[in-house]
């Protein structure tokens, strides 16, 4: 699998899309996981609804949402209020029992907000009354990693 890079701005929302063959993965739930190290396991962040028929319903885990267009074959993940610690390598997965097929490898890059001159300690966090549904989603910038590019920084 090639790795696709999605860039988002700190404090804003990033939308990651993972296209797939809808017939091949028919009836299968999907998941978004975070790769722990270059060869480490992929730790589940969020998965689609337990009932495949309801996969279109958005499910949240913290600031990460997932929704699946099972007819069109597009899995969409939203990372809300993007933070520097969200940067890293992720996977979109299709689940079959205990197995998980990788649909796409994703490298999330977090860019500094050019308009934000505040200290990191002054970063805005959502209040309880603020709805995730009203969050403004920026169009993400994505590209595939060039051959030879390393998604993880080399360790000394």
């Amino acid at each position: 699998h090639n790795t696709t890079v999605f860039q988002g701005v700190a404090g804003q929302s990033l939308q990651v899309s993972c296209p797939y063959d809808s017939m091949k993965h028919w009836g299968r739930r999907k998941a978004w996981c975070r790769q722990l190290g270059e060869k480490g396991p992929c730790q589940r962040v969020v998965s689609t609804h337990n009932l495949w028929l309801l996969s279109f319903l958005r499910r949240w885990n913290g600031s990460t949402a997932i929704t699946d267009d099972t007819l069109g074959g597009t899995l969409t993940i939203t990372l809300r209020n993007l933070q520097p610690h969200d940067a890293g390598l992720y996977q979109c997965q299709s689940l079959h029992g205990s197995e998980a097929d990788t649909l796409r490898k994703v490298l999330v890059e977090v860019l500094a907000d050019p308009l934000d001159h505040r200290d990191a300690g002054d970063l805005w966090f959502p209040g309880e009354s603020e709805s995730f549904e009203d969050a403004h989603v920026e169009h993400s910038i994505s590209r595939s990693l060039l051959e030879g590019e390393i998604p993880f920084p080399p360790t000394s």
Epitope: M23, K24, W26, G27, S98, E99
Partner: antibody
Framework: EVQLVQSGAEVKKPGESLKISCKGS????????IAWVRQMPGKGLEWMGI????????RYSPSFQGQVTISADKSISTAFLKWSSLKASDTAMYFC???????????????WGQGTTVTVSS | DIQMTQSPSSLSASVGDRVTITCRAS??????LGWYQQKPGNAPKRLIY???SLPSGVPSRFSGSGSGPEFTLTISSLQPEDFATYYC?????????FGQGTKVEIT
């Protein structure tokens, strides 16, 4: 009409190679998984493996991994089951079957081929 | 691998009888289970999918139930054409696995 038509009966000697086929018609062949199932004489059904003709993604049962090769050619809407060196214990009826698609999800194996009898004897 | 334990392995019954066959999965398979009928010399035929759904063309005397580890196929009133061997199949996890089969014979 959705159909899977399998190749005819085969009689082979131990050590010989063999490739049997399963041709789909009446539906979009590349878009449905095709499974292979073995039935030894007087015995039950055994799932061997499955292939998605659209991209030839293949999964095998550990019992059959390395013993057979499953392939497909979507341009002729045909799936194949191949042995490179047959054994007497490969004598069986082999079925291909399509994984069904239902509104609520997958529907198991909804359409079956008529079966191919393989006899391996010296 | 998920083991599917089917019981009984055979049974004798008369026309009009109510027949029940069970399949137990060694681990959770949600409702990813089907039931198949096979007559001698023929390919299997799908009777039930998703544990309890009846495909078009299958008589309503056949029904499926259960979820989690235990599933049941019921024939409400056995007909002469129902004497055959019945198999369950789990398609939740690779490798998919069949039950050992239940042969339904005439008393």
């Amino acid at each position: 009409e959705v159909q899977l038509v399998q190749s005819g009966a085969e009689v082979k000697k131990p050590g010989e190679s063999l490739k049997i086929s399963c041709k789909g018609s009446g539906y979009s062949f590349p878009s449905y998984w095709i499974a292979w199932v073995r039935q030894m004489p007087g015995k039950g059904l055994e799932w061997m493996g499955i292939i998605y003709p659209g991209d030839s993604d293949t999964r095998y049962s550990p019992s059959f991994q390395g013993q057979v090769t499953i392939s497909a050619d979507k341009s002729i809407s045909t799936a194949f089951l191949k042995w490179s060196s047959l054994k007497a214990s490969d004598t069986a009826m082999y079925f291909c079957a399509r994984q069904g698609i239902e509104v609520t999800g997958t529907g198991g194996l909804d359409v079956w081929g008529q079966g191919t009898t393989v006899t391996v004897s010296s | 691998d998920i083991q599917m334990t089917q019981s009984p392995s055979s049974l004798s019954a008369s026309v009009g009888d109510r027949v029940t066959i069970t399949c137990r999965a060694s681990q959770g398979i949600r409702n990813d289970l089907g039931w198949y009928q096979q007559k001698p010399g023929n390919a299997p035929k799908r009777l039930i999918y998703a544990a309890s759904s009846l495909p078009s063309g299958v008589p309503s005397r056949f029904s499926g139930s259960g979820s989690g580890p235990e599933f049941t196929l019921t024939i409400s009133s056995l007909q002469p054409e129902d004497f055959a061997t019945y198999y369950c199949l789990q398609h939740n996890s690779y490798p998919w696995t069949f039950g050992q089969g239940t042969k339904v014979e005439i008393t």
